[in-house]
């Protein structure tokens, strides 16, 4: 296992509908082919895995049907979406990239995004 | 296990107000959001509003806007709903729902609810 | 006010039939929807959460399906306990809109 630079930003405010994006950029040192991102959350101390998805180069990124994350890539770069998020999914959402394929195999974590979310009151007539 | 045990059925008259409680139990119950909904007789469901145990904040429905009061007591675990200037249309079933953060990825939305709490309003 | 219409609004099957369930929303919600079971004197049981998830006891021959402002429940093989009225739900944001409910009864 080899280790790899992975870059996001400090903090990212969600919108009044709950939705954050952020871009998570990794140091790619080969020509990897195949991708895997994984969100992880933390808070309290706790780590949970949020949502992943395998990609290959210049295909969109996989989520499963459930997840609450959808995403697109261009190069080193990944664009991350997470909807859903209210106050209570406040916290530290770290960026995991791992190159699979072709070897050797790259593992990169990044420092987090720090996404703040609150709770605003329904508009009349709106969603928000 | 997880419970949600509500108060006991209520009688009011037209006007007054009326206080259901909802204790929970089995799970930290500042983890998970609390709803409240309720059901008119031989009628639907209606969302009436949403309180943060942790917080304490509340978010409600348009319809309940200054009638409706949702507070919580993180020492004994329950929430409470408040509803003033009862009218004949507010008799119902009164049923509180935990949430979680959608992060908690092995939570599901509104899994567990009260028994629930018939509130009937006659004069 | 976020819509949340189901159709149809009552149906009658037989035993084994598959049934179909809709729910539209006025909105774009993603995959931020639940549907529930309520069977007469009883508490909403949740059946399907985020469009297709199925809920931890819930028998498989419940499905969901949909995203974005269109959704369906599905039952493949209608059984005599299924006899209930089916709600969906918005959980995308608040307000968390229920749809007016679909009456389900056995031929």
């Known amino acids: 296992c080899k280790a790899m630079h992975v870059a996001q930003p400090a903090v990212v405010l969600a919108s009044s509908r709950g939705i954050a994006s952020f871009v998570c950029e990794y140091a790619s040192p080969g020509k990897a082919t195949e991708v895997r991102v994984t969100v992880l959350r933390q808070a309290d101390s706790q780590v949970t895995e949020v949502c992943a998805a395998t990609y290959m180069m210049g295909n969109e990124l996989t989520f499963l049907d459930d997840s609450i994350c959808t995403g697109t890539s261009s190069g080193n770069q990944v664009n991350l979406t997470i909807q859903g998020l209210r106050a209570m999914d406040t916290g530290l959402y770290i960026c995991k990239v791992e190159l699979m394929y072709p070897p050797p195999y790259y593992l990169g974590i990044g420092n987090g995004t720090q996404i703040y979310v609150i709770d605003p009151e329904p508009c009349p007539d709106s969603d928000f | 296990q997880v419970q949600l045990v509500q108060s006991g059925a209520e009688v009011k008259k037209p006007g007054a107000s009326v206080k259901v409680s909802c204790k929970a139990s089995g799970y930290t119950f500042t983890s998970y959001y609390m709803h409240w909904v309720r059901q008119a007789p031989g009628q639907g469901l209606e969302w009436m509003g949403i309180?943060?145990?942790?917080?304490?904040?509340?978010i409600y429905a348009q319809k309940f806007q200054g009638r409706v009061t949702m507070t919580r007591d993180t020492s004994t675990s329950t929430v409470y709903m408040e509803l003033s200037g009862l009218i004949s249309e507010d008799t119902a079933v009164y049923y509180c729902?935990?949430?979680?953060?959608?992060?908690?990825?092995?939570?599901?939305?509104?899994?567990?609810w009260g028994q629930g709490t018939l509130v009937t309003v006659s004069s | 006010d976020i819509q949340l219409t189901q159709s149809p609004s009552s149906l009658s099957a037989s035993v084994g039939d598959r049934v179909t369930i809709t729910c539209r929303v006025s909105q774009d919600i993603s995959r931020l929807l639940n549907w529930y079971r309520q069977k007469p004197g009883e508490i909403p049981k949740l059946l399907i959460y985020?469009?297709?998830s199925l809920q931890s006891g819930v028998p498989s021959r419940f499905s969901g399906s949909g995203s974005g402002t269109d959704f369906t429940l599905t039952i493949s093989s209608l059984q005599p306990e299924d006899i209930a009225t089916y709600y969906c739900?918005?959980?995308?944001?608040?307000?968390?809109?229920f749809g007016q409910g679909t009456k389900l009864e056995i031929k």
């Open positions: 739900q918005r959980t995308y944001s608040a307000p968390y809109t």
């Open positions: 309180v943060n145990p942790s917080g304490g904040t509340s």
């Open positions: 985020r469009a297709s």
């Open positions: 729902a935990r949430d979680p953060p959608i992060t908690l990825v092995r939570g599901a939305p509104f899994d567990y």
